[in-house]
Amino acid sequence: APVLPGEDSKDVAAPHSQPLTSSERIDKHIRYILDGISALRKETCNRSNMCESSKEALAENNLNLPKMAEKDGCFQSGFNEDTCLVKIITGLLEFEVYLEYLQNRFESSEEQARAVQMSTKVLIQFLQKKAKNLDAITTPEPTTNASLLTKLQAQNQWLQDMTTHLILRSFKEFLQSSLRALRQM
């Protein structure tokens, strides 16, 4: 199974002296997830032609995936570390249902999909420890997530392939924006 960052003492400088919320540890964790996403995207692109699909087809998909917007304070202009940290945690919590959907979508990369899901849960815990303004963080309703999952799994094959592609692409973009923003916190 893929090794989570920090599980191997060679992976982190002075592993025992670092708090779990340290900048380096969080950064390593995000990069680990991004590596996992790259592997999953590779399998998705090899399996279907979604990666070359037209933007029109992508725009037609009505998934409500978390996305960074100016008001979230995570971009260089209008950067706000408190607002942004809340957005990152909220967004990751919202992505969890989509990561659950991915679990049965891969054959050769099944372990990788599980590793992405598990390490995202750990990342959320790290960031929640870092966040002071926990009141502003809203957790998605379990019933809402369950019905969304059922709906996604009921789609036809083409839509499921498109959904998988969109989740991975959006999650990658979200994590890359998070990485840039967290650097200044």
């Epitope: 003492s9 060679k10 950067f79």
Partner: antibody, heavy 118, light 109 residues
Framework: EVQLLESGGGLVQPGGSLRLSCAAS????????MSWVRQAPGKGPEWVSR????????YYGDSVKGRFTISRDNSKNTLYLQMNSLRAEDTAVYYC?????WGLGDYWGQGTLVTVSS | QTVVTQEPSFSVSPGGTVTLTCGLS?????????PGWYQQTPGQAPRALIY???DRHSGVPDRFSGSISGNKAALTITGAQAEDEADYYC?????????FGGGTQLTVL
């Protein structure tokens, strides 16, 4: 053009205090974490402290922890370093620098000299 | 405490290629350490050359390049020039702090 201008250095006795300032221009100051780095005569640079973009988090090197306080005023585009209980080993040129990110490298000022001597 | 290690000195012939390294006393250097490289000539403030592993600072000649090779960060100067004779320092983010290496004195012979 990115500019960082340190001020407030000078001669101070051991046990004394000093407050350094760094005026920033040419970039979105409030979007960047900022650091103080010092360099003692004939030595290499030593990281002193960092403050997050919004000022909510501060970090210190072991040698200054409990004696120095970093702060910032984003409305004035200014970074500060309050130095208390100064020691001879704090003698150095103090530089302020932005934390690289958003496609911008880290820029350093020209520095301000702090001399701790009786 | 984790120590950032650099070669104390290095020499290179004009036009030659030299690679300076930056390691950790415990563990490997990764992109999450955001390796940075600085050049300092006598009487001058340090000048940033490379940030975030391999991003060249504005105004820095393209003969300077950064990378991570094996378990260390590296600064490569391709086609060294007389004005490259200087002290070179690397910096790594470790945990929540930044640590500088002891520096490499580069001589262009």
């Amino acid at each position: 053009e990115v500019q960082l201008l340190e001020s407030g250095g000078g001669l101070v006795q051991p046990g004394g205090s000093l407050r350094l300032s760094c005026a920033a221009s040419g970039f979105t100051f409030s979007s960047y974490a900022m650091s103080w780095v010092r360099q003692a005569p004939g030595k290499g640079p030593e990281w002193v402290s960092r403050i997050s973009a919004g000022g909510g988090s501060t970090y210190y090197g072991d040698s200054v922890k409990g004696r120095f306080t970093i702060s910032r005023d984003n409305s004035k585009n200014t970074l500060y370093l309050q130095m208390n209980s100064l020691r001879a080993e704090d003698t150095a040129v103090y530089y302020c620098a932005n934390r690289a990110g958003w496609g911008l490298g880290d820029y350093w000022g020209q520095g301000t000299l702090v001399t701790v001597s009786s | 405490q984790t120590v950032v290690t650099q070669e104390p000195s290095f020499s290179v012939s004009p036009g030659g290629t030299v690679t300076l390294t930056c390691g950790l006393s415990s563990g490997s250097v990764t992109a999450s350490n955001y390796p940075g490289w600085y050049q300092q000539t006598p009487g001058q403030a340090p000048r940033a050359l490379i940030y975030s592993t391999n991003d060249r600072h504005s105004g820095v000649p393209d003969r300077f390049s950064g990378s991570i090779s094996g378990n260390k960060a590296a600064l490569t100067i391709t086609g060294a020039q007389a004005e490259d004779e200087a002290d070179y320092y690397c910096a790594l983010d470790i945990g929540d702090i930044t640590e500088f290496g002891g520096g490499t004195q580069l001589t262009v012979l």
